[in-house]
Amino acid sequence: KESCDVQLYIKRQSEHSILAGDPFELECPVKYCANRPHVTWCKLNGTTCVKLEDRQTSWKEEKNISFFILHFEPVLPNDNGSYRCSANFQSNLIESHSTTLYVTDVKSASERPSKDEMASRPWLLYR
């Protein structure tokens, strides 16, 4: 299973519950062998993934893996949705699975949902 291909370690159908107004870092774990690939984030709009050009991103390097991070400072209600990272590697485009952010807009919610509610009833999370 080890190879020198670039691999993007975002789980299929991964989901996160986050609060508007809080900071949040969305990580794209990247494995590569020699040269670090060019990585970008995009946000899904239907079947199209719109590149996020003007957002703050950074790299975090660890021993066996690197993380390309999309920063939300702070999270806004319209950050709700699905995101994907992509890597350019030897003229190939490698796309991650999409990951979904469920944003709770605390101002418009009469009461902050519990973690269990947020996890089990994502349709409540963005009102």
């Epitope: 789980k11 299929r12 991964s14 989901e15 899904l44 699905s82 269990d116 996890a119």
Partner: antibody, heavy 119, light 112 residues
Framework: QVQLVQSGAEVKKPGSSVKVSCKAS????????MYWVRQAPGQGLEWIGR????????RYAQKFQGRATVTADKSTSTAYLELSSLRSEDTAVYYC????????????WGQGTTVTVSS | DIVMTQSPDSLAVSLGERATINCKSS???????????LNWLQQKPGQSPKRLIY???KLDSGVPDRFSGSGSGTDFTLTISSVQAEDVAVYYC?????????FGQGTKLEIK
């Protein structure tokens, strides 16, 4: 290789709760999804819910919403299913299973835990 | 919820003969990555289920190559090319695309 070991059989009274554990080895559970399925005597398989141990995000079948709670402890590589307000129809074998979150490389099931609900 | 319907409910096959089990989903099983997350499980008497096939046609490691999976859209098939005595089991299809995950009702394979 990936293995799951579940807690032992339980006999419970109607209206009570049960908590079943499932300990994983051979894998870092943050790289997986862990899920629970039950099988009533002589019946088929019924999906209860799943958790992403990396962030604790759980999903449930509507039938079990509010009655089932799936949790995971990364430090001990253990997932838990708690089922409350038990009734006789909850008598079943409860299986935990784990699959690779990224590439579908593995899907492994525990040995099952028999839960009997009887007055 | 996605309904998974298997046919037949049971079948009896002679040793060495071919067995075919069908599975129909009530909706497409394509995920956002364009792949169909359709799995086949084998449950032998008194044992836990075990995945045989994932992504419609990919064999799990250690699964004999007499097992194969095929299909697309909403119609899927598990084939055992030459049934052996150890294949006696209940076989389930299940979808790992939509929430909640759902299983077929199972097909019991017996030896004639």
């Amino acid at each position: 290789q990936v293995q799951l070991v579940q807690s032992g059989a339980e006999v419970k009274k109607p209206g009570s709760s049960v908590k079943v554990s499932c300990k994983a080895s051979g894998v870092n559970i943050k790289d997986t999804y862990m899920y629970w399925v039950r099988q009533a005597p002589g019946q088929g398989l019924e999906w209860i819910g799943r958790i992403d141990p990396a962030n604790g995000y759980a999903r449930y079948a509507q039938k079990f919403q509010g009655r089932a709670t799936v949790t995971a402890d990364k430090s001990t590589s253990t997932a838990y299913l708690e089922l409350s307000s038990l009734r006789s129809e909850d008598t079943a074998v409860y299986y935990c299973a784990v699959n690779d979150g990224y590439f579908e490389y593995f899907d492994v099931w525990g040995q099952g835990t028999t839960v009997t609900v009887s007055s | 919820d996605i309904v998974m319907t298997q046919s037949p409910d049971s079948l009896a096959v002679s040793l060495g003969e071919r067995a075919t089990i069908n599975c129909k989903s009530s909706q497409s099983l394509l995920d956002s990555d364009g792949k169909p997350y359709l799995n086949w499980l084998q449950q032998k008497p008194g044992q836990s289920p075990k995945r045989l096939i994932y992504l419609v046609s990919k064999l799990d490691s250690g699964v004999p190559d007499r097992f194969s999976g095929s299909g697309s859209g909403t119609d899927f098939t598990l084939t055992i090319s030459s049934v052996q005595a150890e294949d006696v089991a209940v076989y389930y299809c299940w979808q790992d695309t939509h929430f909640p995950r759902t299983f077929g009702q199972g097909t019991k394979l017996e030896i004639k």
